[in-house]
Interface confidence: low
């Protein structure tokens, strides 16, 4: 099976416009890709199967995203903390300032379309 | 001030491993990754990987993964890389390198380096 | 891999000219808009030193005289007015993805 976790945190250092509202624009497909990239970096493990329905709002840039694991591979505290783990590495290794972390189990059954 | 001092020159037959210290001093050691490198005679710079001491992750270069590896020990803030089954190409001078954030913490760069260690690989 | 291409290998100017270094990145070595690219000066016999960051930022203690410029692929190191001390090897290295690479390195020379 799988576990799937949602995932709200604020970039404190980009600016939001109103190309992170269409998908179409460089801009959102730069920063998906960027922030795919970095969580492929956090969640290394074998448990890590991806993410989707990134979505960006105002607020400085607030992400929102949808976690996937192997089922009892991890659990909502221990996704929370290895996020907040590597805040310091995103700062440096993607020039990003996080803030508000927010993680929360995702009842199934689970639609990829919501 | 941030210094790191690496130990000194090593020659050594082909086949056999060589372990390079690197001692950091001058600021906090654990949360940041340290570099690296090496250029061999006459040549350019060349990455070989890192590791971020605090945890023990390390990053490495895949045309040296299986024959090299970074430890850490934070007790005497001190990392090392050690390269096995040497052969004459490996002749080089291997630098460690601080990958550091300016005194705003804004940017982060490999801002300081070792003095360098000197392998030699000959029979 | 992303490669760094460094030109020209070789520069000889007179002091007092300028100096232009060009990278160039296999592909797109910026995140999130910053360019994670960063020049540095080798001397003989001595360890590389920091000069730019992040493409334009000059280091700490190093003179004005040196500066950077470029986005994405194309990048510049400029020295403003050559002085007999800047005679090294400077390389750009991209931190964009690992592995990390250097360029060739250009060789700047005092005619």
């Known amino acids: 099976g799988v576990s799937f976790f949602f995932l709200s945190f604020h970039i404190s250092n980009l600016q939001f416009n109103s190309s992170l509202e269409d998908p179409s624009t460089d801009y959102y497909q730069e920063l998906q890709r960027d922030i795919s990239e970095m969580f492929l970096q956090i969640y290394k493990q074998g448990g890590f199967l991806g993410l989707s329905n990134i979505k960006f709002r105002p607020g400085s840039v607030v992400v929102q995203l949808t976690l996937a694991f192997r089922e009892g591979t991890i659990n909502v505290h221990d996704v929370e903390t290895q996020f907040n783990q590597y805040k310091t590495e995103a700062a440096s290794r993607y020039n990003l300032t996080i803030s508000d972390v927010s993680v929360s189990d995702v009842p199934f059954p689970f639609s990829a379309q919501s | 001030e941030v210094q790191l001092v690496q130990s000194g020159a090593e020659v050594k037959k082909p086949g056999a491993s060589v372990k390079v210290s690197c001692k950091a001093s001058g600021y906090r050691f654990i949360p940041y990754w340290i570099e690296w490198v090496r250029q061999r005679p006459g040549q350019g710079l060349e990455w070989m990987g890192e590791?971020?001491?605090?945890?023990?992750?390390?990053n490495y270069n895949e045309k040296f993964k299986g024959r090299v590896t970074f430890t850490a020990d934070t007790s005497t803030n001190t990392v090392y890389m050690e390269l096995s089954s040497l052969r004459s190409e490996d002749t080089a001078v291997y630098y460690c390198?601080?990958?550091?954030?300016?005194?705003?913490?804004?940017?982060?760069?490999?801002?300081?380096w070792g003095q360098g260690t000197t392998v030699t690989v000959s029979s | 891999d992303i490669v760094m291409t460094q030109s020209p290998a070789t520069l000889s100017l007179s002091p007092g000219e300028r100096a232009t270094l060009s990278c160039r990145a296999s592909?797109?070595?910026?995140?999130?808009?910053?360019?994670?690219i960063h020049w540095y000066q080798q001397k003989p016999g001595q360890a590389p030193k920091l000069l730019i960051y992040h493409a334009s930022n000059l280091e700490t203690g190093i003179p004005a005289r040196f500066s950077g410029s470029g986005s994405r692929t194309d990048f510049t190191l400029t020295i403003s007015s050559l002085e007999p001390e800047d005679v090294a090897v400077y390389y750009c290295?991209?931190?964009?993805?690992?592995?990390?690479?250097f360029g060739g390195g250009t060789k700047v020379e005092i005619k």
């Open positions: 590791i971020l001491p605090g945890t023990g992750r390390t």
């Open positions: 290295l991209q931190s964009r993805k690992i592995p990390w690479t």
């Open positions: 390198a601080r990958y550091g954030d300016d005194t705003s913490g804004g940017y982060y760069a490999v801002d300081y």
């Open positions: 592909e797109s070595v910026n995140i999130l808009g910053t360019n994670l």
